[in-house]
């Protein structure tokens, strides 16, 4: 049940903050989905605490999470993906706190991969491409991507570009010549499904050509 003690008695434990957050990943392992939850307070003593998900499941009423260090995790095909599930923190048979969550609204896509940048000398531009496993998925197919790049010396001066495709063109004249750049990309659900940004892809590093003094153009790498 949502709420407090089964026997109606409030105990000291219930004065603690058991706030938690979760994210789902659909078809993360073939047709298997996953759900990951963690306490928002890293100092919570998790020794006897368990997580349980009930409702909006196929063939079963509830499922228990596995504990992996500080996180709680389920991998299953049994998410109905219609309606809200009841996710609860339990100690023994007693629930300390519960949240009703629609798993389609807390989707965290898998990180993009195979990020690369190719310089086109004739066009004076850089073609950025990357891949995403979501192109092959049945559910979370439509994503918004956030490409972020910066000059390596500019610690926090990231430029962000949002796009729905997996290809982006950066004009050479918009970048500093003879500079080392770092670029990375992440994704978020963009149609029907809602949720969170994925982890960033591994960064890719590229150098811009120097300016050719006679023509004012950059030299290719």
């Amino acid at each position: 049940e949502s709420g407090y003690a089964q026997n109606g008695d409030l105990e000291d434990a219930e004065l603690d903050d058991y706030s938690f957050s979760c994210y789902s990943q659909l078809e993360v392992n073939g047709s298997q989905h996953s759900l990951t939850c963690a306490f928002e307070d890293p100092d919570v003593n998790i020794t006897n605490l368990e997580f349980e998900i009930c409702g909006a499941l196929v063939e079963v009423k509830c499922l228990n999470f596995r504990k992996l260090q500080e996180i709680y995790f389920i991998e299953t095909k049994k998410f109905l993906l219609i309606g809200k599930s009841n996710i609860c923190v339990k100690v023994g048979e007693k629930s300390l706190t519960c949240k009703k969550i629609d798993l389609t609204t807390i989707v965290k896509p898998e990180a993009p991969f195979d990020l690369s940048v190719v310089y086109r000398e004739g066009a004076n531009d850089f073609v950025v491409t990357f891949n995403t496993s979501h192109l092959q998925k049945k559910y979370v197919k439509v994503l918004m991507h956030d490409v972020a790049y910066r000059q390596e010396k500019d610690e926090n001066k990231w430029t962000h570009v949002n796009l729905s495709s997996t290809k982006l063109t950066l004009l050479q004249r918009k970048l500093q010549p003879a500079a080392m750049y770092e670029i990375k990309v992440r994704s978020i659900p963009d149609h029907y499904f809602k949720g969170f940004w994925s982890e960033w892809s591994p960064s890719y590093y590229f150098r811009t050509p120097e300016i050719n003094n006679s023509s004012g153009e950059m030299d290719p790498i």
Epitope: G3, C54, C62, N86
Partner: antibody, heavy 122, light 106 residues
Framework: QVQLQQPGAELVMPGASVKLSCKAS????????MHWVKQRPGEGLEWIGE????????NDNQKFKGKATLTVDKSSSTAYMQLSSLTSEDSAVYYC???????????????WGQGTSVTVSS | DIQMTQSPSSLSASLGGKVTITCKAS??????IAWYQHKPGKGPRLLIH???TLQPGIPSRFSGSGSGRDYSFSISNLEPVDIATYYC????????FGAGTKLELK
């Protein structure tokens, strides 16, 4: 001990609405969902829906969509069911019933109120 | 929706005897069945849940069994206080009651 108190009877006009109450005592109100069940004279029991008093989340029998609205008042540990656009078909005894302790949806009930007899008549 | 077919609809039995009521679900309900005793003017009383789990305070004369779609409920050593209407309830998906069995004394 667990008690669910319901008024004995309500007489209402056709087309009107009625709000039935169910006052809970003897346990932590927000820890247990509350069900509502209908029984027409000489007939069996029919599930209407359930509500989680901790956050007012409801699961309903589609048959009663638009007819029954479930709410709670946590401060008074009272569950309510509003029945609207009443007809003679709504004349019945309505029970509230506390659900067995479980986090899952759709679970059996343990303690029941005595029921409120609703008569729809002009 | 899951339908519950309860039989018989009425039953006459002798004191000290044994009665059995059955409920058949329209699909597998995974043992999520409860049994209630209902007397006029009162709220129903939970006797058994999850097929065979006896509620605290309920005498062991009451028992339940079954799996899949087929379930049964028995009262042995029948006493006068057992005269009532009995209902099964499936709670696997939504909640559906059987039509009831009225138990009378012979």
């Amino acid at each position: 001990q667990v008690q669910l108190q319901q008024p004995g009877a309500e007489l209402v006009m056709p087309g009107a609405s009625v709000k039935l109450s169910c006052k809970a005592s003897g346990y932590t109100f927000t820890s247990y969902w509350m069900h509502w069940v209908k029984q027409r004279p000489g007939e069996g029991l029919e599930w209407i829906g359930e509500i989680d008093p901790s956050d007012s989340y409801t699961n309903d029998n589609q048959k009663f969509k638009g007819k029954a609205t479930l709410t709670v008042d946590k401060s008074s540990s009272t569950a309510y069911m509003q029945l609207s656009s009443l007809t003679s078909e709504d004349s019945a005894v309505y029970y509230c019933a506390r659900r067995l302790y479980s986090n899952s949806y759709y679970y059996a009930m343990d303690y029941w109120g005595q029921g409120t007899s609703v008569t729809v008549s002009s | 929706d899951i339908q519950m077919t309860q039989s018989p609809s009425s039953l006459s039995a002798s004191l000290g005897g044994k009665v059995t009521i059955t409920c058949k679900a329209s699909q597998d309900i995974k043992k999520y069945i409860a049994w209630y005793q209902h007397k006029p003017g009162k709220g129903p009383r939970l006797l058994i849940h999850y097929t065979s789990t006896l509620q605290p305070g309920i005498p062991s004369r009451f028992s339940g069994s079954g799996s899949g779609r087929d379930y049964s409920f028995s009262i042995s050593n029948l006493e006068p206080v057992d005269i009532a209407t009995y209902y099964c309830l499936q709670y696997d998906n939504l909640l559906t009651f059987g039509a009831g069995t009225k138990l009378e004394l012979k």
